[in-house]
Interface confidence: low
């Protein structure tokens, strides 16, 4: 059994171009054409000087996180595909990315995937409409706003002037006036004005698989939900925020562990 092993299979890295808004997760897929027996898979970003900076790695059944925990590598169940994700992408994450595989001894080989480009765009405050509003209309709205504010200011100034004039002309009439409401009639809230308190659960990982040796890290975005529980009526402790984001769900079984062969 001493003949050389088959040559290393090519890598693919997709999509070739990916655009996400800042704050969203950006996910590339690095795919092996074959399942190698022993290998290391690295995820790189190309620096401006065309050098590769390692972001994270996958070695055997262990994920090796990089310095920045936002960069995550997840092996998919088929064993050939790896999700390489940037959690909450930032504008300066825009750039060129690739994956590289090192096939371990006895026949050490190194292979790099084609490059892929990530563009992280600025998050807009409003979701874009189907047909963008024409600029003149926006100008008209702005103009209306300016006129409205100006009118209110002029009105207030006129009211103050009138009050001053009245005070000057009828000094006695204003001295004993009471400007507060009746003591036995406090200011009322509307009939449905029960205060609303929110308990922000932050990021909840709804997962069901058992623990694996990998260092804890949140799972893929599609397994994450955001929950805000609203309690109308009287609160137990008003204004208190409880976070359950530390309730870390388990990671999917690593490839060394086989497909669900740990019946614990």
């Amino acid at each position: 059994l001493d003949s050389p092993d088959r040559p290393w299979s090519p890598l693919t890295f997709s999509p070739a171009q990916l655009t996400v808004q800042e704050g969203e997760n950006a996910t590339f897929t690095c795919s092996l054409a074959d399942i190698p027996d022993s290998f290391v898979l690295n995820w790189y970003r190309l620096s401006p000087r065309n050098q590769t900076d390692k972001l994270a790695a996958f070695q055997e059944d262990r994920i090796e996180p990089g310095r920045d925990r936002r960069f995550r590598v997840t092996r998919l169940p088929n064993g050939r595909d790896f999700h390489m994700s940037i959690v909450a992408a930032r504008l300066n994450d825009s750039g060129i990315y690739l994956c590289g595989a090192i096939y371990l001894p006895p026949n050490t080989q190194i292979n790099e995937s084609p490059r892929a480009e990530l563009s992280v765009t600025e998050r807009t405050l409003e979701p874009p409409t189907q047909s963008p509003s024409p600029p003149p209309r926006l100008s008209g709205q702005l103009q209306g706003l300016v006129i409205g504010v100006t009118s209110v200011l002029v009105g207030v100034l006129l009211l103050l002037l009138l009050t001053w004039v009245l005070a000057a002309v009828f000094p006695r009439a204003t001295r004993g006036a009471c400007v507060c409401g009746s003591e036995d009639e406090p200011l009322k809230e509307g009939p449905d004005a029960a205060p609303v308190f929110t308990l922000d659960y932050g990021e909840l990982d709804f997962q069901w698989r058992e623990k694996t040796p990998e260092p804890p890290a949140p799972c893929a975005p599609e397994q994450t939900e955001y929950a805000t529980i609203v309690f109308p009526g009287r609160p137990a402790s008003p204004g208190r925020r409880a976070s359950a984001s530390s309730l870390q769900g388990a990671q999917p079984p690593s490839p060394e562990d086989g497909p669900g062969l740990w019946p614990l």
């Epitope: 055997e60 059944d61 262990r62 998919l76 064993g79 694996t212 040796p213 060394e256 740990w262 019946p263």
Partner: antibody
Framework: EVQLVESGGDLVKPAGSLRLSCLAS????????MSWVRQAPEKGLHLVAG????????YYKDAVKGRFTISRDNAKSIVYLQMNSLRVEDTAMYYC????????????WGQGTLVTVSS | DVVMTQTPLSLSVSPGETASISCKAS???????????LTWFRQKPGQSPHRLVY???HRHPGVPDRFSGSGSGTDFTLRISRVEADDTGLYYC?????????FGAGTKVELK
């Protein structure tokens, strides 16, 4: 080169105990789950126990549950199989195997250590 | 338990010929992830088993391409083309998807 060297096999009386050891070299031991597979004389192969890379999850064949304990010392690159309440039917060659995997497990085996349970 | 049935139990081949070993599983070895978890081993007298093929058709590093695995679901075959003297031994198939893992009884391959 991946090497797995078992030791600790012996002749023992029923209800006795033994501890098998497997010293691993030639690979990053702490990255791999490990298994023990046994083969009775002139018989087939049977998975006995498995342990994940961190040592916090284990698997046992029904016939050995409660009697055998698999453990590991990643600092020393050793995996152990503690065998208590041994029975005659536990007589077999015990192999230490790298991995507990459908992708790349069971790829490397030790030379085996013989356990004989007899009165 | 999943029963792995190997045929034939023994096989005598001439050097240079092709040897075929069949393995049938009592249940499908196709996992929901799309992979089929069948492994082939060879054991020589007085030695430990050595993996030849995993996941039906993936050769273990260093295994010559004369060894090829095929099949799907429950029926699998290991073919050894251009048989050499060193190919003799006991060949096992094994499934690593259903708990507990189970192995075939073995096929003894010898030279004519």
């Amino acid at each position: 080169e991946v090497q797995l060297v078992e030791s600790g096999g012996d002749l023992v009386k029923p209800a006795g105990s033994l501890r098998l050891s497997c010293l691993a070299s030639g690979f990053t031991f702490s990255s791999y789950s490990m298994s023990w597979v046994r083969q009775a004389p002139e018989k087939g192969l049977h998975l006995v126990a498995g342990i994940n890379s961190d040592g916090d999850r284990t698997y046992y064949k029904d016939a050995v549950k409660g009697r055998f304990t698999i453990s590991r010392d990643n600092a020393k690159s050793i995996v152990y199989l503690q065998m208590n309440s041994l029975r005659v039917e536990d007589t077999a060659m015990y192999y230490c195997v790298r991995g507990f995997s459908s992708f790349n497990g069971l790829g490397y085996w030790g030379q085996g250590t013989l356990v004989t349970v007899s009165s | 338990d999943v029963v792995m049935t190997q045929t034939p139990l023994s096989l005598s081949v001439s050097p240079g010929e092709t040897a075929s070993i069949s393995c049938k599983a009592s249940q499908s070895l196709l996992h929901s992830d799309g992979n089929t978890y069948l492994t082939w081993f060879r054991q020589k007298p007085g030695q430990s088993p050595h993996r030849l093929v995993y996941a039906v058709s993936h050769r273990h590093p260093g295994v010559p391409d004369r060894f090829s695995g095929s099949g799907s679901g429950t029926d699998f075959t290991l073919r050894i083309s251009r048989v050499e003297a060193d190919d003799t031994g006991l060949y096992y198939c094994g499934q690593v998807i259903h708990d507990p893992w189970t192995f075939g009884a073995g096929t003894k391959v010898e030279l004519k």
